[in-house]
């Protein structure tokens, strides 16, 4: 094929492939018609003036993994048509101005994981039909006004995984065709008002894993096409009361991790497209009437991991679509009998790890198709009577760990347990607190002196899909989950969507945090 | 381009286990759920669970509980289907899906892995 | 489990013609705001490919002549003008509860 490197792969469709750590230089000679070369994991160290020189015809370069670190400005001359180069995982700590000279048709530029300390704005100024620009994973630790402000086409900007300590209100401002940016893992503290104001097409932003303790109440006003906006894994202590006000489009927004104390009623603005709202790890201490009634299509929200003592009758105002409800792992002692009334489509109910003492007998009365309650781990004592007869879908009921008092006034509780017995589940059944002479023996079969009916176990419907809430108070620091740290579930066959297996047999949830590019 | 693609077919032995991997690409993998469907020969389509890469997360089908594990490696953008204790009955076409919210439709598939337990 | 019956199990329809299809099941999968239903099309050799999702939204690129309809219990996929790439095997889903399929119905031209 118009002369094949011995060191590489040539193919009939004009791609060239070079890889072996016995290349350290640019083979030679290069198939003239060729219009894809890739040069990987090689030993090549440097690229010098011109190795492309006779394939002018090349579309897509990728040099990635290699041991470059160095690059003479005029390394990639007589590319002009070339639409795409990578020279990802490398080790360049500088970029040489005018390296992507005459370079007319580049519209993808991956550059990340390098070692890459700073870029200019004479890196890209030549690069007015770029679409996409990969800089995540680099040492840069802050963006020159007028870096990118020859990148109008720009649709995709990566700067996540960098050491970027704070941005400048106008760095993005001539980005109007930007549609994604990620800013995540970096070390950004705060947000300037204005930032994102010129970023009127944007849909994807991500924040997370930032220190970002505040937010400016009209920072995101002008982004009406966002779609996800990541803000997870922050210091974020108070939301202003319009900030999420004008993102009619947002389908994905998460707001874990963070240390939010408090959500004023309306703060989630009109989302018609939110379906899932995650704020577990944070330290709400209550929830107002009407916090989430702008959220009709939500389906999904979890609360867990907070310090939530008091919910408002209202709370739940508006969520007539909630599928999944988590409140473990808070600090409730009561619940208002209504408190769950709007939720007429709830499956799925996570209470557990809690300090409820009683439940109100109505507590579940409009929440007919509820199939998994968790409220093992809290101070309960006794149940109302019949506060499960109406829940004809109920297959995953969890008890265990409650100090339950076993005295006459257990007989009803106990013979509805008797019955409804593999609802219960086979891991852990619930024991008898109180009196002493009982304690640790099964509630369901205990002796309390009375007659028990003979009873018929009836068939239970078949498991349903149970939800997952994040328990853990520690995360992995790999990025990869495999079935050592898989989920437990507190419902049988519903793995908690947030668990890792620790050190107790507690559902816990692990996050791992991983953005690809 | 939306992208999910699914490792060889696999020929195994009854008993033994098999895993299945599903690279995903053009899009960001955490972002998604990733739902895994059975198609026997000349049968439809079951539903084997689903894994949400962002936090591992898993959801079975009780009936395939202690069958299937699902897993991930968020570096490598790959999610993973084991199945243990293989039998006849579990020969099948194995696909993964992309799903944007649990309750979603699966947007896009992967071309499907074929398993054949066979002694 | 919510089971899913389609009908017909096969369908032949000449081309330009419509052709209908029906998922039942025994319980509601709707709420006030959306049916938990879609629809898949699978060809021989490929994996099945989204048609409508929630009832009745019509999945990014697919042709108008699909249409979904349908609340509560009985759902109908309708294809108004059979084209011959729309020869293929048509599964309902729902994610109300675990998923489930239908079994699939064979549409064929006449």
């Known amino acids: 094929y118009h002369g094949c490197p011995s060191e590489c792969t040539c193919s009939r469709a004009s791609q060239v492939e070079c890889t072996g750590a016995r290349i350290v230089a640019v083979p030679t000679p290069l198939p003239w018609n060729a219009m894809s070369l890739q040069i990987l994991n090689t030993h090549i160290t440097e690229l010098n003036e011109s190795p492309f020189l006779n394939i002018s015809a090349l579309i897509a370069l990728r040099i990635e993994k290699n041991e470059l670190s160095r690059i003479t400005p005029g390394a990639f001359r007589n590319l002009g048509s070339l639409r795409y180069l990578s020279l990802a995982n490398n080790k360049l700590q500088v970029l040489p101005i005018g390296l992507f000279q005459g370079l007319d048709s580049l519209e993808s530029l991956l550059l990340s994981s390098n070692q890459l300390l700073q870029i200019q704005p004479a890196h890209f100024s030549q690069c007015s039909n770029l679409k996409e620009l990969q800089l995540h994973g680099n040492h840069l630790e802050y963006i020159p006004d007028g870096a990118f402000d020859h990148l109008v086409g720009l649709t995709k900007l990566n700067l996540g995984k960098n050491s970027l300590t704070h941005i400048s209100p106008r760095v993005f401002q001539h980005l109007g065709n930007l549609q994604v940016l990620r800013l995540y893992e970096n070390r950004l503290t705060d947000i300037p008002m204005g930032t994102f104001d010129g970023l009127v097409n944007l849909q994807e932003l991500a924040l997370q894993q930032n220190q970002i303790g505040l937010l400016s109440p009209g920072l995101f006003h002008n982004n009406h096409n966002l779609q996800r906006l990541y803000l997870s894994n922050n210091h974020i202590s108070q939301l202003p009361p319009s900030v999420f006000m004008q993102l009619p489009q947002l389908n994905r927004l998460t707001l874990f991790g963070n240390s939010l104390k408090e959500l004023s009623p309306g703060i989630f603005g009109p989302m018609p497209n939110l379906r899932e709202l995650w704020l577990y790890d944070n330290h709400i201490s209550s929830l107002p009437d009407n916090v989430f009634s702008n959220l009709r299509q939500l389906q999904v929200l979890i609360l867990s991991r907070n310090q939530i003592s008091f919910i408002s009758p209202g709370a739940f105002n508006g969520l007539t679509e909630l599928r999944e409800l988590s409140l473990h792992t808070n600090a409730l002692q009561d619940l208002d009998g209504n408190v769950f009334r709007m939720l007429a489509n709830l499956q799925n109910i996570s209470l557990q790890n809690n300090r409820l003492r009683q439940l109100p007998g109505n507590i579940f009365a409009n929440v007919n198709g509820l199939m998994a309650i968790q409220l093992q781990n809290n101070q309960l004592e006794n149940l109302p009577l019949g506060i499960f007869d109406h829940l004809g879908k109920l297959c995953e009921l969890r008890l265990y760990d409650n100090p339950w008092r076993c005295d006459s006034d257990i007989l009803p509780l106990r013979n509805w347990l008797l019955l409804n017995q593999p609802r219960l589940g086979t891991d852990t059944v619930p024991v008898c607190f109180s009196p002493a002479n009982v304690r640790g023996q099964s509630l369901i079969i205990i002796n309390v002196n009375v007659a028990v009916p003979s009873v018929h176990v009836p068939e239970v419907p078949s498991y349903p899909e149970t939800p997952w809430y994040p328990d853990t108070p520690s995360y992995p620091d790999t990025t990869s989950v495999s079935s050592t740290t898989e989920l437990t579930s507190p419902v049988e066959d519903y793995t908690d969507l947030t668990t890792i297996q620790v050190t107790d047999d507690r559902s816990v949830w692990g996050m791992t945090q991983a953005q690809s590019g | 381009e939306v992208q999910l693609v699914q490792s060889g077919a696999e020929v195994k032995k009854p008993g033994s286990s098999v895993k299945v991997s599903c690279k995903a690409s053009?899009?960001?993998?955490?972002?998604?759920?990733i739902h895994w469907v059975k198609q026997a020969p000349g049968q439809g389509l079951e539903w084997i669970g689903l894994?949400?890469?962002?936090?591992?997360?898993?959801n079975y089908n009780q009936k395939f509980k202690g069958k299937a594990t699902l897993t991930v490696d968020t570096s490598t953008t790959t999610a993973y289907m084991e199945m243990s204790s293989l039998r006849s009955e579990d020969t099948a076409v194995y696909y993964c899906?992309?799903?944007?919210?649990?309750?979603?439709?699966?947007?896009?598939w992967g071309q499907g892995t074929t398993v054949t337990v066979s002694s | 489990d919510i089971v899913l019956t389609q009908s017909p199990d096969s369908l032949a329809v000449s081309l330009g013609e419509r052709a209908t299809i029906n998922c039942r099941h025994h319980?509601?999968?709707?709420?006030?705001?959306?049916?938990?239903m879609h629809w898949y099309q699978q060809k021989p050799g490929q994996p099945p490919k989204l048609l409508i999702k929630?009832?009745?939204s019509l999945e990014s690129g697919v042709p108008d002549r699909f249409s979904g309809s349908g609340s509560g219990t009985d759902f109908t996929l309708t294809i108004s003008s059979l084209q011959a790439e729309d020869v293929a095997v048509y599964y309902c889903?729902?994610?109300?509860?675990?998923?489930?399929f239908g079994g699939g119905t064979k549409v064929e031209i006449k």
């Open positions: 899906a992309r799903g944007d919210n649990k309750y979603d439709a699966m947007d896009y």
């Open positions: 053009g899009f960001t993998f955490t972002d998604y759920y």
């Open positions: 894994v949400y890469p962002y936090i591992g997360g898993t």
């Open positions: 319980q509601s999968v709707s709420t006030s705001s959306y049916s938990y």
């Open positions: 929630y009832a009745s």
């Open positions: 889903e729902q994610s109300w509860e675990i998923r489930t």
